[in-house]
């Protein structure tokens, strides 16, 4: 093969948490390159060296070598977060490369803390006992203790505290969770006694106090929420759903939820009962169908809650917002970056809904004419555009293998939105179609970078 | 008749593993709990812990949390109170009783374990 | 935890003596108040409960009275059967604690 220069591609970890190690690994990887000599360097982002390095024997892979280099940083410097990388150096006769290797954020995050307490209905066995629940929420690093009080006083009796969890997210840092319960007896919680739920975080301590006395009176705690039709339930199931919900009932034998026109006729309403909550409540949702047609008008509906907690009924009332400005959405479709093909591993096909209103949108991935399982793909919630007030922008990224890329295999984004011809658009791209969008490149980075 | 009938007694070594039963009878077992108390010798109560048979919840007083374990067998209507590794401070009366939301209405015999090497 | 401080730890009497002992609590619990009795070798046995109510099958000489933190137990005409420790103890919450004992000797 001819002498080539290296491709530098940075190696960070997928783990969000190096919190809990005492130090925290990144490494730099040197591709294609010929002949096989080959010196790594690193260097912090203010060009003083860094030391604590580790180099990896090149490896021969279809006539060209590749080689890593790995650095280890202490966790405390990261976490600091005044570098946020460093700089990968190549030395090597066919040319000097050098890349930035991004470092994992380390966020420290203080927990959010919330306490459940058990209904008035919510006491068992005998002597009668319940369960006092405190969630710690949303916090980074892992290290937490929970403890509880009672009256101010430490309690060592009926304390069960879970492992720390990590959250399930998709972006970001990781952040964590712990759950705590305290088994009380009914005489405790209602001789008004106050416990405490106490968290320390990082030299910090959260206070969540709860007690029989604080408990909201019964006919206020119902709350009851009435939620319009989504514009993409519209358009995949052609119904239009009107939802309301009803949260923190004690009882769900005797809850009804009902809908009305205008007008004051009813219209016909299923109720669901969901499991209780993790407080003790129940919540119950009511579906009512209706006509697009009607929803369309600007028809006003209402949803009307009994139950035996509530001295009187509660009514929510929506309608379709007026006067929203309609702009269709101009849809761009980004195939992976050659870099990452390069990778071997993974292609990510990305789809860029702009400047559309209102930011109701539905996106859908499809191959060969069939829609793909949305785990294949994730799409953003829409977000304001900020050079454009009252109109928004989203994204969905498909992720497929690099083989499957490779094949020519065809993938479609379809964007549905109220503001489009047919209500209906669709790009598709393939491996022939890579090299195409290169002329507006310029034109999708200056859109990312908004 | 509403009875606790409890195991009888035990002489153990210092480091050896014993589980002492008190089996319920006359009444429904798993409407009812069962506390565990001890008397040491020539001394007063002191409340061990409590078990729900109906769903085995325990809660242990902080003085015993880890030092004991208390469990039941509802189809047999028994309850356990075990230790892993005895003590010669472990030396005393154990009683089992029936707590009920106007206290400890019905009590066991009482089982007397003795600890010496 | 709630402390049960009981006083005297221990008394003398007469048969037919009127004989009070009294257990007090750290902090309030209500009603949550019962009082035990137990002789030599055997079991304790419940006399009364939430402060004041007497036992099934418990003789009505016995009787109790309190609420908060002060309470009660009164034997109204000590009989020779009623010689034994008494103890007070609290059930409003976890852990229960009990008293440390109130012994009634014949004088």
């Known amino acids: 093969g001819s002498a080539s220069a290296p491709t530098l591609f940075p190696l960070v970890s997928c783990e969000n948490s190096p919190s809990d190690t005492s130090s925290v690994a990144v490494g730099c990887l040197a591709q294609d390159f010929l002949p096989d000599s080959i010196t790594f360097s690193w260097k912090y982002k203010n060009n003083s060296d860094i030391s604590s390095t580790r180099g990896f024997p090149s490896v021969l892979r279809g006539g060209k070598y590749a080689a890593t280099s790995q650095v280890l940083l202490p966790s405390k410097d990261v976490m600091q977060g005044t570098d946020e990388h460093v700089v990968c150096k190549v030395q090597h006769p066919n040319g000097n490369k050098e890349k930035n290797v991004p470092l994992p954020v380390i966020a420290e995050l203080p927990p959010k803390v919330s306490v459940f307490v058990p209904p008035r209905d919510g006491f068992f066995g005998n002597p009668r006992k319940s369960k006092l629940i405190c969630q710690a929420t949303g916090f980074s690093p892992r290290q937490i203790q929970v403890s509880w009080l009672r009256e101010g006083k430490q309690v060592g009796s009926g304390v069960t505290t879970d492992q720390v969890q990590a959250e399930a997210k998709e972006s970001g840092p990781t952040t964590y969770k712990v759950t705590s319960t305290l088994t009380i007896k009914e005489s405790d919680w209602l001789g008004q006694s106050m416990f405490t739920c106490r968290v320390d975080h990082r030299g910090l301590t959260f206070q969540q106090n709860a007690s029989s006395m604080c408990v909201p009176d019964q006919d206020t705690a119902i709350r009851v929420f009435a939620i319009p039709p989504s514009f993409a339930s519209i358009f995949l199931t052609k119904s239009t759903k009107l939802t309301c919900l009803v949260t923190d009932l004690t009882t769900y034998d005797s809850v009804t939820i009902s809908w009305t026109r205008q007008n004051g006729e009813a219209v016909k309403t299923h109720t669901n009962i969901s499991e209780s909550h993790p407080n003790a409540t129940f919540s119950a949702v009511g579906e009512a169908s209706i006509c697009e047609d009607d929803w369309n008008s600007g028809e006003r509906f209402t949803c009307t809650v009994t139950h035996t907690d509530l001295p009187s009924p509660l009514k929510q009332t929506i309608s379709r917002p007026k006067g929203v400005a309609l702009h269709r959405p101009d849809v761009y479709l980004l195939p992976p970056a050659r870099e990452q093909l390069n990778l071997r591993e993974s292609a990510t096909i990305t789809c860029l809904v702009t400047g559309f209103s209102p930011a109701d949108v539905f996106v859908q991935w499809m191959q060969r004419g069939q829609p793909l399982s949305p785990e294949k793909y994730v799409t953003s919630a829409p977000m304001p555009e900020p050079q454009a007030p009252g109109r928004y922008f989203a994204h969905s990224i498909l992720t497929v293998s690099e083989e499957e890329w490779n094949t020519g295999e065809t993938y479609t984004c379809v964007v549905a939105h109220e503001a489009l011809p047919n209500r209906v658009t669709e790009r598709t791209v393939d491996k022939s179609t890579e090299g195409e969008v290169s002329a507006d490149e310029e034109g999708f980075e200056n859109l990312w970078a908004t | 008749e509403v009875q606790l009938v409890q195991s009888g007694a035990e002489v153990k070594k210092p480091g050896e593993s014993l589980k002492i039963s008190c089996k319920g009878s006359?009444?429904?077992?798993?409407?009812?709990?069962i506390s565990w108390v001890r008397q040491m010798p020539g001394k007063g109560l002191e409340w061990m812990g409590i078990i729900y048979p109906s769903d085995s919840d325990t809660i242990y007083s902080p003085s015993f949390q880890g030092q004991v374990t208390i469990s039941a067998d509802k189809s047999i209507s028994t309850a356990y109170l075990q230790w892993s590794s005895l003590k010669a401070s472990d030396t005393a009366m154990y009683y089992c009783?029936?707590?009920?939301?106007?206290?400890?209405?019905?009590w066991g015999q009482g089982t007397l374990v003795t600890v010496s090497s | 935890d709630i402390q049960m401080t009981q006083s005297p730890s221990s008394l003398s009497a007469s048969v037919g003596d009127r004989v009070t002992i009294t257990c007090r609590a750290s902090q309030s619990i209500s009603s949550y108040l019962n009082w035990y009795q137990q002789k030599p070798g055997k079991a304790p046995k419940l006399l009364i409960y939430?402060?004041?109510r007497l036992q099934s099958g418990v003789p009505s000489r016995f009787s109790g009275s309190g609420s908060g933190t002060d309470f009660t137990l009164t034997i109204s005409s000590l009989q020779p059967e009623d010689f034994a420790t008494y103890y007070c103890?609290?059930?409003?919450?976890?852990?229960?604690?009990f008293g440390q004992g109130t012994k009634v000797e014949i004088k």
């Open positions: 006359g009444y429904s077992f798993t409407t009812y709990t």
């Open positions: 009783a029936r707590s009920s939301v106007v206290g400890f209405d019905v």
């Open positions: 103890q609290q059930h409003l919450s976890w852990p229960e604690t």
């Open positions: 939430a402060a004041s």
